[in-house]
């Protein structure tokens, strides 16, 4: 009896230009014998429904269509038909399909492969046109995918430490999306500092399908209205 | 930094088992296979056997296969090497060490070594 | 099993000097187009070291007076001027089948 198991779930989720391994497991009842079985990769594309051979290995031989595609012949010898993929680009996701022959029996397993990059966040305050008092912080994310993405602000005072979502005076700008299929969005939060209390912290938080936490940047407001000590890698005003 | 480190020197009686651990750092665990491998006093190099953190597939030197148990724990990036039914033949140094699987097969990083002790 | 055979199993060397080692294998190591023969130093009282694999690939951070050449069964580690630091054993080993295995080793020393 010969299977195939793929990564559970059917989804395999990676970051932009990551070295991604997809996991592909062969349970065979024998040893296997490399030199006669034969395995072979193939992609279809989220946008077309056409698939598309990646990369071959048979007996004594290996092909690679895509470049640097490969299975490794070391890792095969003890079930692991995993493709490494170097460098892996947003139109790379999709279906792959691992398909193994030890004749004369077959088996074959699929996997979507979600490609995701991880927004850049960075805090700046922008005072050209703003009146007395009035400063406009903006919250800058860029190099992002896929599209959909939350940008809160929060703040928090000596008198309530738990932080508060912000929801009035907060104008989130359109996704641009980039040359290379990433994007950016730029969410802006309009301040009256001499209604807030010095000391109060204010946080921009971005979440994104590629964070396993969401990414904060925050400022605190001071007497001499503004400082900027973000936590993350963001400009820094004084 | 990559880097392999190995559990300390072991003094065992013949006849029983001894279990190597090998603590991974610095690179993707996964993305490596594991090798054994020993030197007795004196003597060359000789390899055990290695593994895949992937899915814990094993190859195994034939002259130790039924002796030898390489597993893994993924969780905290450790491989360990379990030989029993100890024979002083066995007293060497034990080496783990990182090997790469895709590009070539080669040993790139090395634990410092655990050395092994077989005496009644 | 592979066999492999390496000459000299010793070698006394004058700093500044060339050094050659040579490891013959059984049968070969060859698979695909490529070379599965990898080279190993081992200082004294120190695991093995990666010198150069696929036979002729410098590892990162070893000296380029080191080269290896070859193919098939025969292959050659070449060390262009000896200095005091490459004393130890040198090992080739295959990869190419199962058991790996290395050679018996070549002691080099400094005279």
């Known amino acids: 009896d010969l299977k195939v198991e793929m990564m559970a779930g059917g989804t395999q989720i990676t970051p932009l230009n990551d070295n991604v391994t997809i996991f592909c497991n062969i349970f065979y009842s024998q040893p296997l014998n490399i030199t006669s079985m034969g395995i072979t990769w193939f992609w279809k594309s989220l946008t077309f429904d056409k698939e598309v051979k990646v990369f071959e290995f048979f007996g004594d031989h290996q092909e690679a269509f895509r470049p640097g595609a490969i299975v490794s012949p070391w890792r095969l010898k003890s079930g692991d038909a995993s493709l490494r993929l170097p460098g892996i680009q947003l139109e790379e996701a999709g279906e792959y399909r691992c398909e193994v022959v030890v004749t004369p029996l077959k088996a074959q397993g699929t996997v979507q492969l979600e490609v995701v990059a991880s927004p850049a966040s960075r805090l700046l305050l922008d005072q050209v046109g703003m009146k007395e008092n009035e400063d406009k912080y903006m919250c800058e994310s860029s190099g992002f995918y896929p599209e959909a993405i939350n940008i809160t602000w929060e703040k928090q005072t000596q008198k309530f430490p738990h932080p508060i979502e912000i929801s009035e005076d907060v104008i989130t700008g359109p996704t641009i999306k980039n040359m290379d299929g990433t994007f950016n969005v730029t969410s802006c939060l309009k301040l009256n500092s001499s209604q807030e209390d010095p000391g109060t912290v204010y946080q921009c938080v971005v979440r994104h399908a590629s964070l396993h936490t969401p990414l904060r940047s925050n400022f605190t407001l001071t007497a001499a209205r503004h400082s900027l000590s973000e936590t993350e890698k963001t400009d820094n005003f004084s | 930094e990559v880097q392999l480190v190995q559990s300390g020197a072991e003094v065992k009686k013949p006849g029983a088992s001894v279990k190597v651990s090998c603590k991974a750092s610095?690179?993707?665990?996964?993305?490596?296979?594991m090798d054994w491998v020993r030197q007795a006093p004196g003597q060359g190099l000789e390899w055990i056997g290695d593994i895949n953190p992937n899915n814990g597939g094993t190859l195994y030197n034939q002259k130790f296969r039924g002796r030898v148990t390489l597993t893994v724990d993924t969780s905290i990036s450790t491989a360990y090497m379990e030989l029993s039914r100890l024979r002083s033949d066995d007293t060497a140094v034990y080496y783990c060490?990182?090997?790469?699987?895709?590009?070539?097969?080669?040993?790139?990083?090395w634990g410092q070594g655990t050395t092994v002790t077989v005496s009644s | 099993d592979i066999v492999l055979t390496q000459t000299p199993l010793s070698l006394s060397v004058t700093p500044g000097q060339p050094a050659s080692i040579s490891c013959k294998a059984s049968?070969?190591?060859?698979?695909?187009?490529?070379?599965?023969m990898n080279w190993y130093l081992q200082k004294p009282g120190q695991p093995p070291q990666l010198l150069i694999y696929a036979a002729s690939t410098l590892h990162s951070g070893v000296p380029d007076r080191f080269s290896g050449s070859g193919s098939g069964t025969d292959f050659t580690l070449k060390i262009s001027r000896v200095e005091a630091e490459d004393v130890g054993v040198y090992y080739c080993?295959?990869?190419?089948?199962?058991?790996?295995?290395f050679g018996q080793g070549t002691k080099l020393e400094i005279k």
């Open positions: 080993q295959q990869s190419k089948e199962d058991p790996r295995t």
């Open positions: 049968q070969s190591v060859d698979y695909d187009g490529d070379s599965y």
């Open positions: 610095g690179y993707t665990f996964t993305d490596y296979n």
């Open positions: 060490a990182r090997s790469e699987v895709f590009y070539g097969n080669y040993a790139d990083y």
